[in-house]
């Protein structure tokens, strides 16, 4: 239970006092305040908001609040030379042009500095050519095109629908296929839920709405010009040709009205199957090129965006711990938005603001947490997780020695159906115990716990009576803390019903229509889901910062390690002959997992029994728990991805948003049947099994008795 050291509030009321202080009305008020104008990274408006948050966090009672600035590579459209795509006739005349901006939402017609839709970090260019429709531009979509349909994308402009995977992976795949340009569009099949009106009458995407977003493939590098090191005043910057992760071909996003005009003329091959058809009234022909009557027409892209080194600002607030000030629990979320940020990020930032206010209220009453809590308002998340990554690079030595946990706080909602949690297995028990103590906000679950409604609506696929908790992937600010530094991390938000809503993300994601009104009218009028998310995020931070013994259960890691080992073994066993030929064995991995399980079990027994009044022993046991996540870090990183260093989890090489388990082995096995040198390929599988087995065994030994 929570500590009562250095406090005048009795232990059982500590958490309750904190949770009771959180108010839905305040979150609503903060959300309104944060969403009236755009807060694009690198702009004066976002700098002003940083200073406002700094000032308010000081007022709330934090011990110190500082701005941490960095000069990083950002990307903006050219204000006088707009980006667009044309259909051109045989004479080169533009007979159709895509829109230059989204129709502004009601009440926002006179707002200035709304950045038009663009793909951040697209190079400049004006390629023209035939169009090829590539579905979601996933790895498997290009396999289908190239291997089964024998369609060559080389020299073509590809058009891909948003959804399923991170847009940067789509662009990477298109580049590898030889495309000379990429058009990204939102298909109603993915961004228009049946039976719901489009904004402003509902939460669906209108035909003129467009999803912005970066198209980098940074693999955890942070600022493309200063990988591994902070982009500070004396930074050495790479030349643009050596920058990390920049796309090499022009890319531009459009809405479905414009997509209709491009896709309706498509000829060539029919779609291979129904999974390639969206909801537009077009044939979804793959191409290449337009059909008979229009075969002389081409598509031309006009992209004039520029990459610029620009100053960004994180806000870092500190609430010093009373007992272990050198142990840090971090709550962080970003502040920068593409436009108004009604959901992303300000529904999260408003929750962080209220959590800070509540902690500040307790502090003013004489309470302090056991451990130090750091609060962060990150900048330039939308441009590649830049603010968080640069700060972590600057403070990496402190973080790797002192970092207990990181809780992410981007969008609080992506729906209003049930809770969604992604976290390290170390936090499973914390999340379970906390949600059992919180009230469910869901209709039909009055008087029931959050755990109960969550478990009912989102059951675990493996364990009956338990809720689903997912692996951490990436695409958000926890990345550097978890994947690079090995700090136990978690995230929570309210989500949609994935079974009935098959669209990707939420329909208005990264569009101009992500406004305060979207949230207040359609998603959470009472802000009860926001309050619940505040209780979950804040409650996790409270327990992590205040429990005498860290609320980590290493036995849950043992369970998932066995599950992941079984899964990767079964993938490998799809090639039984090759495994025999090349003497591929998983014995070392299963043995390491078995050892981990036994040692974790014994550690947990000792954890129950040790003398918690002995501060040295307490600190020793807590350090073993804190450093367990760190023990899964391989200092050499994953192949070709040096900043993804966690051996158990990494963002999928095919979808940055998704987490992959035993990623080194998984990637070595992926498409292995197509490798030109099978002996070398299976040798790499064996090496990755060795690395994984060693890492699991080494991690296990950190839990053994110290002497």
């Amino acid at each position: 239970k929570s500590s009562n050291e250095a406090t005048n509030i009795t232990p059982k009321h500590n958490m309750k006092a904190f949770l009771d202080e959180l108010k839905a009305e305040n979150i609503k008020k903060f959300l309104y305040n944060f969403t009236q104008i755009p807060h694009l990274a690198g702009t004066e408006q976002n700098f002003q908001l940083a200073k406002q948050i700094q000032s308010q966090w000081k007022e709330f009672g934090l011990d110190s609040v500082e701005l941490a600035h960095y000069d990083v590579l950002l990307s903006y459209p050219n204000k006088t030379h707009p980006n667009y795509i044309s259909i051109i006739n045989e004479d080169g005349n533009e007979i159709f042009n895509t829109s230059l901006f989204e129709p502004p939402p009601p009440g926002y017609e006179n707002v200035s500095d709304i950045v038009p839709p663009f793909s951040a970090f697209s190079p400049q260019g004006m390629p023209e050519g035939d169009l090829v429709y590539v579905n979601y531009a996933r790895t498997e979509d290009f396999f289908k095109l190239e291997r089964d349909m024998k369609i060559n994308c080389s020299g073509k402009i590809v058009i891909a629908r948003y959804g399923k995977v991170f847009r940067g992976n789509k662009v990477k795949n298109a580049q590898l296929a030889g495309a000379k340009g990429v058009i990204l569009y939102s298909d109603p099949a993915d961004y228009f839920a049946p039976g719901v009106k489009s904004y402003p009458d509902g939460w669906n995407l209108p035909g003129g709405g467009v999803q912005r977003g970066n198209i980098l493939n940074l693999n955890g590098a942070g600022d493309p010009l200063t990988p591994g090191y902070p982009a500070n005043e004396y930074a050495y910057r790479r030349g643009i040709a050596e920058a990390v992760g920049l796309p090499s071909i022009p890319v531009h996003p459009i809405g479905y009205y414009d997509a209709q005009k491009l896709l309706e003329k498509m000829g060539g091959s029919a779609p291979p199957d129904s999974s390639w058809r969206g909801s537009l009234k077009v044939p979804y022909n793959v191409g290449p090129g337009f059909t008979g009557n229009f075969s002389t027409q081409k598509v031309k892209m006009h992209i004039h965006s520029t990459n610029e080194v620009t100053r960004i600002y994180n806000v870092i607030g500190t609430l010093r711990g009373a007992v272990e000030p050198d142990r840090y629990v971090i709550l962080g979320g970003h502040r920068d938005s593409w436009v108004f940020g009604g959901i992303d990020p300000q529904s999260g930032a408003a929750v962080v603001h209220e959590i800070v206010r509540s902690f500040g209220t307790l502090k003013k009453e004489g309470w302090r947490p056991r451990r130090t809590i750091l609060f962060a308002s990150w900048d330039a998340e939308e441009f590649g997780l830049l603010g968080s990554t640069e700060w972590a690079e600057e403070n990496s030595r402190l973080l790797q020695e002192r970092g207990v946990a990181y809780i992410n706080a981007d969008s609080s909602i992506e729906g209003n159906y049930t809770l969604r949690v992604d976290c390290t297995p170390l936090m499973y028990s914390l999340v379970h115990n906390l949600t059992k103590e919180l009230k469910s906000p869901d209709e039909g679950f009055e008087g029931k716990s959050l755990y109960e409604s969550w478990t009912k609506k989102s059951p675990s696929p493996e364990f009956s009576g338990m809720p689903r908790i997912s692996k951490l992937g990436s695409g958000n600010d926890f990345e550097v803390f978890f994947q690079r530094l090995g700090i136990a991390s978690g995230r929570a938000r309210y989500t949609k019903n994935w079974e009935t809503n098959k669209f990707s993300g939420y329909p208005l994601y990264h569009s101009v229509y992500e406004t305060y009104e979207l949230v207040e009218k359609f998603y959470d009028p009472m802000f009860k889901y926001h309050l619940t998310v505040a209780q979950v995020r804040g409650g996790m931070v409270f327990e992590l910062a205040n429990s005498i013994v860290l609320p980590f259960d290493c036995r849950d890691y043992a369970v998932v390690l066995r599950k992941y080992a079984d899964k990767i073994y079964s993938i490998s066993m799809k090639h039984p002959q090759e495994m025999k030929t090349y003497s591929v064995s998983f014995d070392s991995l299963f043995s390491a997992v078995k050892n981990f399980t036994e040692i974790a079990s014994k550690f947990s027994e000792r954890l129950q029994d040790f003398d918690k009044s002995n501060p040295i022993v307490l600190r020793m046991m807590n350090d073993q728990l804190m450093f367990l996540e760190r023990a899964f870090i391989d200092p050499l990183g994953l192949p070709d991805r040096p900043f993804y260093r966690h051996v158990i989890y990494a963002p999928s090489s095919h979808n940055k948003y998704a987490g992959e388990s035993f990623p080194g082995i998984y990637d070595a096995l992926f498409d292995i049947e197509s490798k030109v040198d099978p002996s070398k390929a299976w040798g790499e599988v064996k090496r990755q099994i060795y690395v994984a087995a060693f890492t699991v065994q080494a991690a296990a030994e950190t839990l053994s008795e110290v002497a």
């Epitope: 159709f96 829109s99 017609e109 035909g207």
Partner: nanobody
């Protein structure tokens, strides 16, 4: 009150020019495609020109292509029609009409009309 008010009509000799304007009030012009439509004496309505909400696309009836130019100033909530090389058959009442669908990329149905301005081309 939602309304469109046309102006700029008049009498002009063949080969002459006129510039029609249409002022919108009560709704944001910036979100909608806009049309010019005309009705010659004793005839039905004829669509003349369309401009998308953002000005990225302009479409014209074959009879006016190369002579008429549709434009807009969203900051002033106004629509224009520059008419050059006017012919007697261009004589008509000219109406501006708002497109029904926010963000439409091609002309759709109209839902708000002006009262019209008379253009007479005569020697």
């Amino acid at each position: 009150e939602v309304q469109l008010v046309e102006s700029g009509g008049g009498v002009v000799r063949p080969g002459g020019s006129l510039r029609l304007s249409c002022a919108a009030s009560g709704f944001p012009l910036i979100s909608y495609g806009m049309n010019w439509v005309r009705q010659a004496p004793g005839k039905g309505l004829d669509w003349v020109a369309f401009i998308t909400y953002d000005g990225s696309n302009r479409y014209y009836a074959d009879s006016v292509k190369g002579r008429f130019t549709i434009s807009r100033d969203n900051s002033k909530n106004t629509l224009h029609l520059q008419m050059n090389s006017l012919r007697p058959e261009d004589t008509a009442v000219y109406y501006c009409a708002k497109d029904r669908i926010v963000g439409a990329r091609v002309p759709d149905a109209y839902d708000i009309w002006g009262q019209g301005t008379m253009v007479t081309v005569s020697s």
